[in-house]
Every structure is written in C-alpha cells, then in structure tokens.
C-alpha cells in the first residue's frame, strides 16, 4: 500500500510542478519594473522570456514579441533552452509514469517492468526540475548583474540639468513559481525512485532443502515467492496454488474501465 | 456618446468641505481609470487626482494630499472628491476626465466651479 | 516631480502660416519597455474644457485635422500647426503621463498676428 501511495504522491507532486514549470514559462512576469525609486510610475514594464509589456494606469496593456533570434542574449536563449528541456522531460516523464502506476494495470505488465518506468520517470522528473530551477537561477544571476550594472549607471553622467531615469528590473512572479515548481518536480521525481525500490523484485532463489517430517514428506521449492523489499503486504505475490484467495491487487484481474491499453 | 457631467460645486468658506460628483454615460465606467484635474481662474491646468479602474490605487498632487480623497462607484458609474480643509487657492473649475491609451484624457466634463472664500 | 516648461508662453501667427510650440520636460519621458514618450498635447479654447490631440507625444486622436503633427522625444517636444487656421486659436498644453504627479506646462496661448 505505501509504495502505491508513494508512486503515486510522486506523480500528482511531478505534475503539479511541471504545470507551474509550463505556466513559468508562459508567464510574462520573469522580471518587473523595480519602483524603488520611484513608486508612483504611471507606467510599469515587466518582461518575459517571450515577450516584454507595458501597463499604463489607464489600465492599456501593450506586449511585444522577440521577434528576433539572433539578437536576443545569449543567457536568455540558454534560459529558453533549460526550460523547454525542463517541460519536454516532464512531459515524457508524466507519460511514462502514467503506464508505471501500480493503480492502473496494462495487459501482464511484469512488475519489474513497472519499476523500471518507475525509476526512468522518476530520473526524467528529477532532470526537468533541476532544468527548471537551473533555467530560474541564470535569469536571476542575470537581473541582478543588470540590476548593480543600471544602478551604478543611474549616479553617473548626471552633469546636465536633464534627469534621464533608467529602468531597472527586479525579481517577477514567474521567478518564484520557477522556482518552487522545480523544486516539486524534483521532490515528486526522488518520490517516483523511492517507490521504484519498493516496486523491484529482488530475484533471490534459495536451494531447494527437503525436510523429513515424521510420517510424511513435503518439499519446498524455490521460487514460490518472490522476495520483495516492498512496504508491507502491497507487492504482488505468484500464487503456488490457485485458491479462492487472491491479493489486494489482483482482485480485478479483466479488464475494465480503469484499464489503460 | 461618452458624456462626463459634474456636479457638488459652489461656494464655500475656508475650511470647509464639499464631495464633487461626475456622473459617467456612454462607456463602460469600470473599464476605465479615471481623474479630476482643476483649473484656477485665468490660470493653466493642475492635476489633482487619479483613482485607478479597480479603485485600489489612488494618487493625488501634494497640494491636495491628505485633505481631498477621490473614489469611485462603478455600480452607480459615479466618480468622486471629497474635498475637506479646503483653502482659498483650491478655488478652480474642477473638470472630471478619462484617462486612455498613453495615460492621456480623452474625455472631459464641462466642469464644476468650487470657490473657497469667507 | 516632473516640471514641464513651454516656450512661448504666447504667439501670434498670420493665417495659413505656421506655428511651432515647444515643450521641455525635466526628465526623460522615453520609456524604455515600449519606446514611447508618455507626453501629451490638449486645446482649450476660451469657455471649454480641454481637448487631447496627442498622446504618445506623436499619435494624434481621432478627429484631430492633420495640420496638427506632434514630434520630439526624451525630454525636448513639439506641437506644430502647419498651416494655421481661425479656429485654432486657443491655449495649449503639453503634458507628462508618464509618472505621478502628471504635471503640465503653463500653457502657449496662440493668437492671429
């Protein structure tokens, strides 16, 4: 039951994390208009990984596109790179997972089989959130270089009577849903390679010992049971005799609605 | 047609407290942020206030800030000022505008004329 | 605050002729995220309330004669008539939308020389 529980806390955390990672990505808040000095501005710029927008107190909003690829940073092409890689793998990871979930039953699927998806989306979970905080990180490393860079700027070449304000920029939303939405991803991506240790069967063949009862014999053999490091009674056993008793899991053994082909 | 009409004006000795009031028709009020600036006679223009469309931002010129206080009611499509320790220099016309694209005011009213003497 | 300076405070143009007015503003009303000066240009004729010509200090309103253009960026504008007519006569102002307090300029009044 906990490694069921485990698999599948793990996939709702991953998922809800990589929804954050693409709703980050999307977002145009990555960085907003710092109004330290001066709070009053009729007029806020925030930017994206996309696009950059204004909004006035009017209420009109205007975004512009990058529409150009080469003349972009080369620290926001990288940042574009990371969180991208950071979806893709979540999403194949969501994918995976989605077969790898002990809840759901596809055809004979071994359970070593399982395990195997278990730990590959668990490893892809794990890369997408490290992509994502990774990607978060350098776009922070940046703002703040620029950040030093315009306020040094801002008290220097003031000789005339002529202000001219620069805009700096501070830390936006996106950031910190970046941020924590990695940080999920990679948490529910240990959970999938925790759960995968209980999910792998551990072949263990023990030498067949025949012991000489008083009156009859019986025989053990190898092989009745697989050795399972599992949580509990949850794993799967093979049945040595096909008794009325079955196991949690097996109860539903034909397909039905909940099954996924 | 988009029609801004003012009304509260009159005169009033030092001191004293008066609430303007626009009415607003012919465009969808809450869309939009909206401001009151005044006129003193023969004089130039003077912004006074700003309340933006949601109504939780509001920012006023330092002449007027802490005695006058603007507000709105979009469900009556009514703007606002209440002006209290009014002074003798806060005599004007006070128009009621919209502000646009560009932070512009696109449309005025006709004005109210508030005179502040003893 | 941002002050806004107009020169000339009054000017007398001939019929057909042109008149340029000129407004300064004490910071840069350039900004940076759009590319666009946060100045506006109103027309108040004696009696009536302002009426906006320019936003973005060059984008006329609608229903403005093209014999109005609006120009400059930064901190240096311009609000010319190309060809002067009767019923420009008025008083104009220039103001800053681009952080508060909105101020504007003292006014230019136009007359017919």
């Known amino acids: 039951m906990a490694v069921t529980a485990c698999q599948g806390l793990g996939f709702v955390v991953s998922l809800i994390g990589i929804a954050g990672i693409i709703a980050a990505t999307c977002m145009d808040q990555w960085s907003t208009q710092d109004l330290y000095n001066n709070p009053v501005t009729a007029v806020f710029n925030y930017q994206g990984l996309w696009r950059s927008c204004v909004r006035e107190s009017s209420g009109f909003t205007e975004c512009r596109g990058y529409f150009t690829l080469l003349g972009l940073p080369a620290m926001l092409q990288a940042v574009r790179a990371l969180m991208i890689v950071g979806i893709v793998l979540g999403a194949i990871g969501l994918l995976v997972s989605i077969f790898a979930l002990k809840c759901i039953r596809i055809g004979s699927m071994e359970d070593s089989a399982k395990a195997n998806m278990t730990l590959t989306s668990g490893i892809m979970f794990i890369v997408s959130g490290l992509c994502a905080i990774a990607g978060v990180s350098v776009f922070a490393n940046m703002l703040v270089t620029n950040f030093w860079m315009s306020t040094a700027n801002m008290y220097t070449g003031m000789g005339g009577m002529v202000q001219t304000v620069q805009t700096r920029y501070t830390f936006g939303a996106a950031l910190f849903v970046g941020w924590v939405a990695g940080g999920l991803t990679l948490i529910g991506g240990v959970m999938m390679c925790i759960a995968c240790r209980g999910l792998a069967p551990e072949e263990t063949n023990y030498k067949a010992v025949s012991y000489h009862a008083s009156g009859h014999s019986v025989a053990y053999k190898p092989g009745g049971f697989k050795a399972s490091t599992g949580f509990g009674s949850n794993t799967k056993n093979k049945k040595i005799y096909d008794g009325g008793a079955r196991t949690e899991d097996e109860v539903q053994s034909y397909p039905s609605k909940h099954d996924y082909v | 047609e988009v029609q801004l009409l003012e009304s509260g004006g009159g005169l009033v000795q030092p001191g004293g407290s008066l609430r303007l009031s626009c009415a607003a028709s012919g465009f969808t009020f809450s869309s939009y942020t909206m401001s009151w600036v005044r006129q003193a006679p023969g004089k130039g223009l003077e912004w006074v206030a700003t309340?933006?469309?949601?109504?939780?931002?509001?920012y006023y010129a330092d002449s007027v800030k802490g005695r006058f206080t603007i507000s709105r009611d979009n469900s009556k499509n009514t703007l606002y000022l209440q002006m209290n320790s009014l002074r003798a220099e806060d005599t004007a016309v006070y128009y009621c505008?919209?502000?646009?694209?560009?932070?512009?005011?696109?449309?005025w009213g006709q004005g109210t004329l508030v005179t502040v003497s003893s | 605050d941002i002050v806004m300076t107009q020169s000339p405070d009054s000017l007398a143009v001939s019929l057909g002729e042109r008149a340029t007015i000129n407004c300064k503003s004490s910071?840069?009303?350039?900004?940076?995220?759009?590319?666009?000066?946060?100045l506006s240009w109103y027309q108040q004729k004696p009696g009536q309330p302002p009426k906006l010509l320019f936003y973005?200090?060059?984008t006329r309103e609608s229903g403005v004669p093209d014999r109005f253009s609006g120009s400059g960026s930064g901190t240096d504008f311009t609000l010319t008539i190309s060809s002067l007519q009767a019923e420009d006569v008025a008083v104009y102002y220039c103001?800053?939308?681009?952080?508060?307090?909105?101020?504007f300029g003292q006014g230019t009044k136009l007359e017919i020389k």
């Open positions: 910071q840069s009303l350039l900004n940076s995220g759009n590319q666009k000066n946060y």
């Open positions: 973005w200090a060059s």
């Open positions: 309340i933006i469309i949601g109504g939780s931002y509001t």
């Open positions: 103001q800053n939308d681009y952080s508060y307090p909105f101020t």
């Open positions: 505008t919209r502000l646009v694209k560009g932070n512009a005011m696109d449309y």
